[in-house]
Interface confidence: low
């Protein structure tokens, strides 16, 4: 057996592919349930059918399994701007995405929020907006890139990284950074 596997993986590896070991009798290999179904009762003996039932509405299994319950369908997070791309079926979870001209910003592995793609005002598009990445902008002369927006060099302080990009203008600039409002 492969070391460091969980108990279920250890038990499954004893049986041929597509089968799992009976939890009460390790001499019996039962056939796994098809996607879209779940395990209702283990097979009673060798060569006998596993009792699989179809997932109920609002739940799914996306692969062959011996789960005692189907998985609950995901719900798209409206507060994150997500929209439903395709609804949940018995064998496939809900697919959530973003609207046109938006990209996904992942806060964590499973949580994303939809944001509008940058238009690169005062600059040009270096890389187009993609599903998981905002537009990458290149700024026109007299502007520097900060947090993916092109900001006038008049907002560049000597202490910031923009000094090299804004070198000709920097000598006459006053510090205005602390006065930003919406």
């Amino acid at each position: 057996l492969v070391p460091h596997l969980g108990d279920r993986e250890k038990r499954d590896s004893v049986c041929p592919q597509g089968k799992y070991i009976h939890p009460q009798n390790n001499s019996i290999c039962c056939t796994k349930c098809h996607k879209g179904t779940y395990l209702y009762n283990d097979c009673p003996g060798p060569g006998q059918d596993t009792d699989c039932r179809e997932c109920e509405s609002g739940s799914f299994t996306a692969s062959e399994n011996h789960l005692r319950h189907c998985l609950s369908c995901s719900k798209c997070r409206k507060e994150m701007g997500q929209v439903e791309i395709s609804s949940c079926t018995v064998d496939r979870d809900t697919v959530c995405g973003c609207r046109k001209n938006q990209y996904r910003h992942y806060w964590s592995e499973n949580l994303f929020q939809c944001f509008n793609c940058s238009l690169c005002l005062n600059g040009t598009v270096h890389l187009s907006c993609q599903e998981k990445q905002n537009t990458v902008c290149t700024c026109h002369a007299g502007f520097f890139l900060r947090e993916n927006e092109c900001v006038s060099c008049s907002n560049c302080k000597k202490s910031l990284e923009c000094t090299k990009l804004c070198l000709p203008q920097i000598e006459n600039v006053k510090g205005t950074e602390d006065s930003g409002t919406t």
């Epitope: 507060e79 994150m80 910003h105 806060w107 964590s108 929020q113 944001f115 900060r146 947090e147 993916n148 927006e149 202490s159 910031l160 950074e177 602390d178 930003g180």
Partner: nanobody, 119 residues
Framework: EVQLLESGGGLVQPGGSLRLSCAAS????????MGWVRQAPGKGLEWVSQ????????YYAHSVKGRFTISRDNSKNTLYLQMNSLRAEDTAVYYC????????????WGQGTLVTVSS
């Protein structure tokens, strides 16, 4: 899961001070601009203040400038708002916010913390 837990609110008299804290988890705190927004009773959300990920840039709404100070401790994944010279019109629920850029929409979680300024 992203979590923002605001604390430090309470009842204070006009002219008094409070310090709000926001403990963040579930994301790489140091990568993001953070800020505060507030919602007064019966009103919409109002942007209050914002601080860049490295704390080298701060922004304030005109209504709070000179009275409120935003700061952060990246080693503790915590955001702060020092509120001085409080006025009745500062009464609101204050929410901690995360930003992906200077003008991007914010997202906030949790219940917020209620600040009541009253004599």
């Amino acid at each position: 899961e992203v979590q923002l837990l605001e604390s430090g609110g309470g009842l204070v008299q006009p002219g008094g001070s409070l310090r709000l804290s926001c403990a963040a988890s579930g994301f790489t705190f140091v990568k993001y601009s953070m800020g505060w927004v507030r919602q007064a009773p019966g009103k919409g959300l109002e942007w209050v203040s914002q601080i860049s990920n490295t704390a080298d840039r701060t922004y304030y709404a005109h209504s709070v400038k000179g009275r409120f100070t935003i700061s952060r401790d990246n080693s503790k994944n915590t955001l702060y708002l020092q509120m001085n010279s409080l006025r009745a019109e500062d009464t609101a629920v204050y929410y901690c916010a995360v930003y992906t850029g200077r003008w991007e929409p914010f997202v906030y979680w949790g219940q917020g913390t209620l600040v009541t300024v009253s004599s």
